[in-house]
């Protein structure tokens, strides 16, 4: 805390400018204005204050809101967003999808920190659902941010929004997540014809069911191994020697390289060693 | 439900064989879902997987004790067991068996039994 | 073979606190991490299976989150109960491994 001093003659700040980088920390709490640093926020980012004179800056402004920031504050707060914690942040009601941008800016670069994680849920909640935008928005700067989120989470992802998901927002998610994802993506690629759906599901079908998988293998799919190995154990355990050649088409080869990793090392386990002799690769159950 | 119960001798000499005997109680040997393995901890020291078994008779051992281990399975007495050979004073540890059922990992385990290697 | 490191070996916690092991795999283990539990005279117990879910009948202050080569398993709140030793280990590949283990002690 900074203590109450009056401000020296000739200092009170009448804008928000580079001058104000002289002012030791006890005259910017004296001579700046609460309200004239809110309405002027946008010209701190151009001023090289350091670290304690944000501190400052930070202060004046908790005490002009202490119960949160307006959003016109929050969208203009640049680097002083780095200075807030989470509490400070779950008192905020951020709506805008430009305030959100301009913050998440600031920590570009940088992993996920425990601020931007809260800035991120007080939005999406805000919202009610993950829509396409947003979910644009957060995969771009975080491209593992859908993984990050729990199941009961994802649930709140319309399916349109399931349009926006690269394949390498998914690189992290586990089962769960893709239980959970899947389905949605089903039903958002579901006008597609065989080999565009095929394009668009690969990368949830870590959740796909045994007979979503039997339904492909009749459709010369040609999944790759990297897809194969990411499919659920229990959803490959039920398939049969024939369905997993169909549905490997000429990567059927991949599999000898698998052996000893799951799923492949599971199913294996599961067939009949003269079904698995069929496929020529020397396969052990 | 599934229960499981090491038997065999808790005292073994060195370079002879130790052999213990997992006795499946509540379920059967024979599920297509689980895999039997043998998991080892010596006094004050961590776990180490042994080896698995199917039912088929498939096995699975670590690498570093493959060249004395055979695990083998009766499913007519619903039982698997272990033989390492060649024990050594190393070897002295408390003996697991454990279901590893495919979607989980060792969710059931026997109580344990102590062998040490000793003349 | 996938080499499990576990860290810390050991940690000195209080009653409510809320305590976090990590596990790295030498090479990815995909989501195929489990951890468990294990008091001293006993036999290890299930709590989290493939990096994330609860084992039936574990408290849900357990959790586990993680994939490739970095996992984690949390204790939200930790009780009188929890003082004990934790591994995990991968069954990614055919040669299962477990972690080192992580002694968790009474402040």
């Known amino acids: 805390e900074v203590e109450k001093t009056a401000c020296p003659s000739g200092k009170k700040a009448r804008e928000i400018d580079e001058s104000l980088i002289f002012y030791k920390k006890w005259e910017l709490e004296a001579c700046v204005d609460a309200a004239l640093l809110a309405t002027q926020m946008d010209r701190v980012n151009a001023i090289p204050f350091t670290y304690e004179q944000l501190d400052v800056l930070k202060h004046k402004l908790d005490e002009l809101y202490p119960q949160g920031y307006p959003e016109s504050v929050i969208q203009h707060l640049g680097y002083l967003f780095l200075k807030m914690s989470p509490e400070d942040i779950r008192k905020w009601n951020v709506t805008s999808l430009e305030t959100l941008k301009a913050l998440l800016e600031v920590n570009k670069g940088h992993e996920m920190s425990p601020q931007v994680a809260t800035l991120i849920d007080r939005f999406v909640k805000g919202r009610g659902q993950l829509d396409k935008d947003t979910l644009d928005t957060l995969t771009a700067f975080y491209p593992g941010y859908l993984c990050s989120l729990s199941p009961e989470e994802l649930s709140s992802v319309p399916p349109s929004s399931i349009w926006a998901v690269r394949p390498q927002d998914l690189d992290t998610c586990d089962p769960r997540q893709l239980d959970v994802l899947y389905p949605k993506a089903r039903l958002a690629f579901q006008n597609m014809n065989g080999s565009e759906y095929f394009v668009k599901i690969q990368s949830f079908l870590g959740g796909a069911p045994t007979e979503d998988l039997k339904a492909l293998s009749q459709q010369n799919v040609s999944m790759d191994l990297a897809t194969f190995m990411k499919l659920r154990t229990d959803a490959v355990l039920p398939l049969t020697v024939a369905e997993v050649q169909k549905l490997l088409g000429p990567h059927v080869e991949g599999l000898k390289a698998e052996e000893r990793h799951r799923p492949v090392r599971d199913w294996i386990l599961r067939q009949r060693q003269d079904d698995l002799d069929t496929l020529g690769l020397g396969l052990q159950g | 439900q599934v229960q499981l119960q090491e038997s065999g001798p808790g005292l073994v000499k060195p370079s002879e064989t130790l052999s213990l005997t997992c006795t499946v109680s509540?379920?059967?040997?024979?599920?297509?879902?689980?895999?039997w393995s043998w998991i080892r901890q010596p006094p004050g020291k961590g776990l180490e997987w042994i080896g698995y078994i199917y039912y088929s008779g498939s096995t699975n051992y670590n690498p570093s004790l493959k060249s004395r281990v055979t695990i083998s399975v009766d499913t007519s007495k619903n039982q698997f067991s272990l033989k390492l050979s060649s024990v050594t004073a190393a070897d002295t540890a408390v003996y697991y068996c454990?279901?590893?059922?495919?979607?989980?990992?060792?969710?059931?385990w026997g109580q344990g039994t102590m062998v040490t290697v000793s003349s | 073979d996938i080499q499990m490191t576990q860290s810390p070996s050991s940690l000195s916690a209080s009653v409510g606190d809320r305590v976090t092991i990590t596990c790295r795999a030498s090479q990815s283990s995909r989501y195929y991490v489990n951890w468990y539990q294990q008091k001293p005279g006993k036999a290890p117990k299930l709590l989290i299976y493939?990096?994330?879910s609860l084992q039936s009948g574990v408290p849900s202050r357990f959790s586990g989150s993680g994939s490739g080569t970095d996992f984690t398993l949390t204790i939200s709140s930790l009780q009188p109960e929890d003082f004990a030793t934790y591994y995990c280990?991968?069954?990614?590949?055919?040669?299962?491994?477990f972690g080192g283990g992580t002694k968790v002690e009474i402040k």
């Open positions: 454990a279901r590893d059922f495919v979607l989980s990992g060792f969710d059931i």
């Open positions: 493939a990096a994330s």
């Open positions: 509540g379920g059967s040997v024979s599920s297509r879902d689980d895999l």
């Open positions: 280990q991968q069954s990614y590949d055919a040669s299962y491994t």
